[in-house]
């Protein structure tokens, strides 16, 4: 069993939906648009890809979740916050931020109106 | 113990209706996505139909698009699969299969299989 | 619709020997989305690798995935008698989640 359950509490709250959903599909679907023709992402070769793949499944899991804006927001911060320490500049973490603003509407919902996407600190 | 049980197959006549049931048992079953999976008689697996933790998100394989809905009931642990205008072609084994995926690296596989009931379209 | 091709359709090997499987798609797959099953006659089929080079749980290390784009290999490096069987790839990252035809691995 590889699953890590949710935590305990109101069974609604978006921190428990954020937790049962796979959010690796979203992220590595904005660091194929971002890293494009690059090396390696996470073991798992994203050259020569199809990006659909990971936006189907990424598309799939947001849409298990209450489509309200908080729910959307901390999805969105968490995906951010997984990423972070595999983003090696600025320019990298600015990309990363706007694909991942882009992504509720990639997947036809609605995007959250404010999201604060600076995570870990302020490290990004 | 993990545990999945599909019950509902037999004999049905060409363009005839029949409902697949999969019992699951030992785990959270409103935690997982759903698959139907078919094998014809000496032939390979062929994927049949999915559903999401939460019913949001169905797909169909194309050869059963418009005859066949899957659906779930989470508070019964159940999930079904309605089968209608039935075909010979549909004559197979229906395997019931949950899905997971690996936490820490994303990757989905189906890791729990029914052993599977038997269709038979014939006349 | 992505199509899985095996090959060879039929290998036949003896005890002891390496075995080595193909998948090929007729599109890319992420290599996150491709897994491999054995099944044996009369029984479901069994969770052996996804992510195209994860074991799952249970499997023997003699059992190794590779590959990436549109070219997967599983491998069984030292064949043991209860390895005979039919292998498949799947495919589910792009609905629909379609499964090779499959691999008959015999005995010699």
């Known amino acids: 069993m590889r699953r890590e359950r949710g935590r305990q509490g109101d069974s609604s709250s978006c921190e428990r939906q954020v937790d049962r959903v796979n959010l690796k599909p979203c992220e590595q679907h904005i660091m194929q648009r971002i890293m494009g023709e690059q090396e390696q992402y996470d073991s798992y070769d994203i050259r020569s890809t199809r990006s659909s793949d990971q936006q189907q499944r990424c598309c799939d899991e947001l849409n298990e979740m209450e489509n309200t804006q908080r729910c959307m927001c901390e999805a969105l911060q968490q995906i951010m916050e997984n990423q972070c320490d595999r983003l090696q500049d600025r320019q990298m973490v600015q990309q990363f931020k706007r694909e991942l603003m882009n992504l509720p509407q990639q997947c036809n919902f609605r995007a959250p109106q404010r999201c604060d996407l600076d995570v870990s600190g302020g490290r990004c | 113990e993990v545990q999945l049980v599909e019950s509902g197959g037999g004999l049905v006549q060409p363009g005839g209706s029949l409902r697949l049931s999969c019992a699951a048992s030992?785990?959270?079953?409103?935690?997982?996505?759903m698959n139907w999976v078919r094998q014809a008689p000496g032939k390979g697996l062929e994927w049949v139909s999915s559903?999401?933790?939460?019913?949001?998100?169905?797909y169909y394989a194309d050869s059963v698009k418009g005859r066949f809905t899957i659906s779930r009931d989470n508070a019964k642990n159940s999930l079904y699969l309605q089968m209608n205008s039935l075909r010979d072609e549909d004559t197979a084994v229906y395997y019931c299969?949950?899905?997971?995926?690996?936490?820490?690296?994303?990757?989905?596989?189906?890791?729990?299989w029914g052993k599977g009931t038997t269709v038979t379209v014939s006349s | 619709e992505i199509v899985l091709t095996q090959s060879p359709g039929t290998l036949s090997l003896s005890p002891g020997e390496r075995a080595t499987l193909s998948c090929r798609a007729s599109?890319?797959?992420?290599?996150?989305?491709l897994v491999w099953y054995q099944q044996k006659p009369g029984q479901a089929p069994r969770l052996l690798m996804y992510?195209?080079?994860t074991r799952a749980t249970g499997i023997p290390d003699r059992f190794s995935g590779s590959g990436s784009g549109t070219d997967f290999t599983l491998t069984i490096s030292r064949l043991e008698p209860e390895d005979f069987a039919v292998y498949y790839c799947?495919?589910?990252?792009?609905?629909?989640?379609?499964f090779g035809q499959g691999t008959k691995l015999e005995i010699k």
């Open positions: 030992g785990f959270i079953f409103s935690d997982y996505n």
């Open positions: 799947q495919q589910n990252g792009n609905s629909p989640y379609t």
């Open positions: 559903i999401t933790r939460s019913s949001r998100t169905i």
């Open positions: 299969a949950r899905e997971d995926f690996d936490v820490s690296t994303g990757p989905y596989y189906m890791d729990v």
């Open positions: 599109q890319s797959v992420s290599n996150m989305f």
């Open positions: 992510g195209a080079s």
